[in-house]
């Protein structure tokens, strides 16, 4: 039961995380105009990975896409790449993990196969989460660098007569969404990897031995005791069950109308 719960929870957490990564990647507010210690402007600027927007106090908002690839900063391209890789890996991970879920029956899939798929999806979620966190962190670092550079020469002008206010940008909502989403995907991936350990059949078998009570030929099968060897060199010991140890979670059930094929 614990394995199923861990796997299910890992899947749900990763699903939320990947949805968040997608949302963050699409959001326009990666960087927003810094309003602190600035003249009050009737125009608010904010930028995303794909376009920059201007919202006027009149309510009119205009967004312009970055219709160039070569003209964009390498760092922005790197952030885009990291986020896309994160989304792709996360999406594949989700697809793999759906088939790996214990609560879903697909033919006569072995537990070992499900364990491998769970591990694969877990690793994918971990890498996906790390990509998102890295992407957001790179962008945040870029913002911090630019912020202090623009603060250093915030007012530029001709002999101090005419002043040009330099627009400074600070962290936008998308960065926080990205960090949280990346973290959730990472946690989900770790949970999947933990669930994988519970799913995998152990190398050491659970031996069952028959005890002959006096006057009765009743076979007693100890359930929860691992016997790596029999009891001494009793040649009458019969091997009744020679499978991997299974908890109630792993007991095969027949497909019902609620199972997905």
């Amino acid at each position: 039961m614990a394995v199923t719960a861990c796997q299910g929870l890992g899947f749900v957490v990763s699903l939320i995380g990947i949805a968040g990564i997608i949302a963050a990647t699409c959001m326009d507010q990666w960087s927003t105009q810094d309003l602190y210690n600035n003249p009050v402007t009737a125009v608010f600027n904010y930028q995303g990975l794909w376009r920059s927007c201007v919202r006027e106090s009149s309510g009119f908002t205009e967004c312009r896409g970055y219709f160039t690839l070569l003209g964009l900063p390498a760092m922005l391209q790197a952030v885009r790449a990291l986020m896309i890789v994160g989304i792709v890996l996360g999406a594949i991970g989700l697809l793999v993990s759906i088939f790996a879920l214990k609560c879903i029956r697909i033919g006569s899939m072995e537990d070992s196969a499900k364990a491998n798929m769970t591990l694969t999806s877990g690793i994918m979620f971990i890498v996906s989460g790390l990509c998102a966190i890295a992407g957001v962190s790179v962008f945040a670092n870029m913002l911090v660098t630019n912020f202090w550079m623009s603060t250093a020469n915030m007012y530029t002008g001709m002999g101090g007569m005419v002043q040009t206010v330099q627009t400074r940008y600070t962290f936008g909502a998308a960065l926080f969404v990205g960090w949280v989403a990346g973290g959730l995907t990472l946690i989900g991936g770790v949970m999947m990897c933990i669930a994988c350990r519970g799913l995998a059949p152990e190398e050491t078998n659970y031996k069952a031995v028959s005890y002959h009570a006096s006057g009765h030929s009743v076979a007693y099968k100890p359930g929860g005791f691992k016997a790596s060897t029999g009891f001494g060199s009793n040649t009458k010991n019969k091997k009744i069950y020679d499978g991997g140890a299974r908890t109630e979670d792993e007991v095969q059930s027949y497909p019902s109308k609620h199972d997905y094929v």
Epitope: V40, A42, V54, E56, F60, T164
Partner: antibody, heavy 118, light 113 residues
Framework: EVQLVESGGGLVKPGGSLRLSCAAS????????VSWVRQAPGKGLEWVSS????????YYADSVKGRFTISRDNAKNSLYLQMNSLRAEDTAVYYC???????????WGQGTSVTVSS | DIVMTQSPSSLSVSPGERVTISCKSS????????????LTWYQQKPGQPPKLLIY???TRESGVPDRFSGSGSGTDFTLTISSFQAEDVAVYYC?????????FGAGTKLELK
Amino acid sequence: EVQLVESGGGLVKPGGSLRLSCAASGFTFSNSAVSWVRQAPGKGLEWVSSITSGVSYTYYADSVKGRFTISRDNAKNSLYLQMNSLRAEDTAVYYCTRQFKGNALDYWGQGTSVTVSS
Amino acid sequence: DIVMTQSPSSLSVSPGERVTISCKSSQSLLNSGNQKNYLTWYQQKPGQPPKLLIYWASTRESGVPDRFSGSGSGTDFTLTISSFQAEDVAVYYCQNDYFYPLTFGAGTKLELK
């Protein structure tokens, strides 16, 4: 057709109060930023106050800050300007305007006259 | 506050003449986000409320005759009437629409010569 109709102007003594109203029609009032602009007799235009749509941020000219309060009632399609501690220099025609692209004031009412005199 | 300086303060013009009105702001009105200048021009005829002519320094409002044009960037702006008409007799105002308070210029009065 866009229409802005101001009301509430009149003669008031210095230190007195007055509340101007502006009834808007012909456009989605709740989605628009609106402003008050005044013009003293024989003088130029002076922006007084603005209120944005949505969260309703308010902005004021330094000369009226702390004395005037701009507000809106989207349900009634109305804009208001509560004027307290009126001074002789507040005597002017007050125009209700709508803000448009570029924050430009594209529609203006006919104005309501406010006279502050003892 | 942003100071808007208009010149000349008044001008007598003959019909068909080209008119240029200058407006200077104490700070740049250029927004880096969209590369637009937040300067607006208005026309006010006697006894009437002002009328929007040009916004974003050079975008003509719909219904405004094409003899009116706006130009300039940053701090220096110009309103041009390519061929002055009798109905253009009015006071013209420029306005800073970038910084609060949204200050107006003192106005330029155009009279018929």
